[in-house]
Amino acid sequence: MKVLQEPTCVSDYMSISTCEWKMGGPTNCSAELRLLYQLVFQSSETHTCVPENNGGVGCVCHLLMDDVVSMDNYTLDLWAGQQLLWKGSFKPSEHVKPRAPGNLTVHTNVSDTVLLTWSNPYPPDNYLYNDLTYAVNIWNENDLADSRIHNVTYLKPTLRIPASTLKSGISYRARVRAWAQHYNTTWSEWSPSTKWYNSYREPFEQR
């Protein structure tokens, strides 16, 4: 049994880190493998993660961590029974992938503006709360080429766009993702998308 692609891990900088890797051949990850992880300091407790399959040769493990802080560094040992397949380390604060924003809502009650709001995925006492910026993807359901990205570089999780910049009488979808500047993180996953109908009509004299 051999590791083809070594584990790579990302942390949500709260309590969950996710590690993914590929094996040399088809593997029943949960039956054959265990990922052991231990905080590097004195003789900290060793924890065990049971991986799941992620495609034929891929495995994924969700490591539960007791409140990740900046100082934490973990050793990782990938075992197949009594055989150590791989040994590495992982510092969560240096491999942050933010949680996805939630509660994306579209407000169209203001006549000429589409207002999108969403929730910051972190509580205010987390350092990432004031460090997130966002990308909002809006696309035309009937024409995938009619797609745009709006970068939201201010802290407030809102975006206003003139309804006139969208085609009238068309259904649009939007989704949002986040990243943290200070930590130079990867982008979060996209939020679930939300749909609305653009009923905006230009004033008669502008037609």
Partner: antibody, heavy 121, light 107 residues
Framework: QVQLQESGGGLVQPGGSLRLSCAAS????????LTWVRQAPGKGLEWVST????????LYADSVKDRFTISRDNAKNTLYLLMNSLKPEDTAVYYC??????????????WGQGTTVTVSS | DIQMTQSPSSLSASLGDRVTITCQAS??????LAWYQQKPGQAPKLLIY???RLQTGVPSRFSGSGSGTSFTLTISGLETEDLATYYC?????????FGQGTKLEIK
């Protein structure tokens, strides 16, 4: 606002025990790692011990490991430090400290006023 | 363990002076550095976190810079109330460590 109030310090003989408490208010106690820092007379700051928010992880300086035990009661918003086998070099002002954000252990934005522990015969 | 070395260990400066205190880490700590001020008989007070971020309520004459292994705390115009001992602290790896302190006196 955040308040941290230590108590339990005093004079104790070498080899004796003491339990320090830190009563906290003004923040969500159960969301933060909390730390004890000490300062010997005329000396600098020294990290003693940290307990993570849920209490599952405890960390100690080598100088106190196996003698001191940090614990917390999230229902009572109180942090503790049980000090056994005390030595004269444990004589110091003991501070409890809270980090600015819950994903830091240090970067202490709030400190108690300190409680004095004197180990002497 | 990461050693934090402050220099100078003490300094004397005049009111209005620009004062610089440095902190050297024995290995890279990215920007996980905090600066504290401690006045006699008081608990320490956080001035700077994340290497350069000013804590709320701290006068703007205080500033922090640096990343990696070399950090600086600057007081741009020394005032009487700045008489204190200043400590740096790394938040990068266990165990948490402080510098030995820099005692600032007013000439």
């Amino acid at each position: 606002q955040v308040q941290l109030q230590e108590s339990g310090g005093g004079l104790v003989q070498p080899g004796g025990s003491l339990r320090l408490s830190c009563a906290a208010s003004g923040f969500t106690f159960s969301s933060y790692s909390l730390t004890w820092v000490r300062q010997a007379p005329g000396k600098g700051l020294e990290w003693v011990s940290t307990i993570k928010a849920r209490g599952g992880t405890t960390l100690y300086a080598d100088s106190v490991k196996d003698r001191f035990t940090i614990s917390r009661d999230n229902a009572k918003n109180t942090l503790y430090l049980l000090m056994n086998s005390l030595k004269p070099e444990d004589t110091a002002v003991y501070y409890c400290a809270k980090p600015l954000y819950n994903n830091f252990a240090g970067h202490f934005g709030s400190w108690g006023q300190g409680t004095t522990v004197t180990v002497s015969s | 363990d990461i050693q934090m070395t402050q220099s100078p260990s003490s300094l004397s400066a005049s009111l209005g002076d620009r004062v610089t205190i440095t902190c050297q880490a024995s290995q890279s700590i990215s920007s996980y550095l905090a600066w504290y001020q401690q006045k006699p008989g008081q608990a320490p007070k956080l001035l700077i976190y994340g290497g350069s971020r000013l804590q709320t309520g701290v006068p703007s004459r205080f500033s922090g810079s640096g990343s990696g292994t070399s950090f600086t705390l600057t007081i741009s115009g020394l005032e009487t109330e700045d008489l204190a001992t200043y400590y740096c602290q790394q938040d990068y790896s266990w165990p948490l460590t402080f510098g030995q302190g820099t005692k600032l006196e007013i000439k």
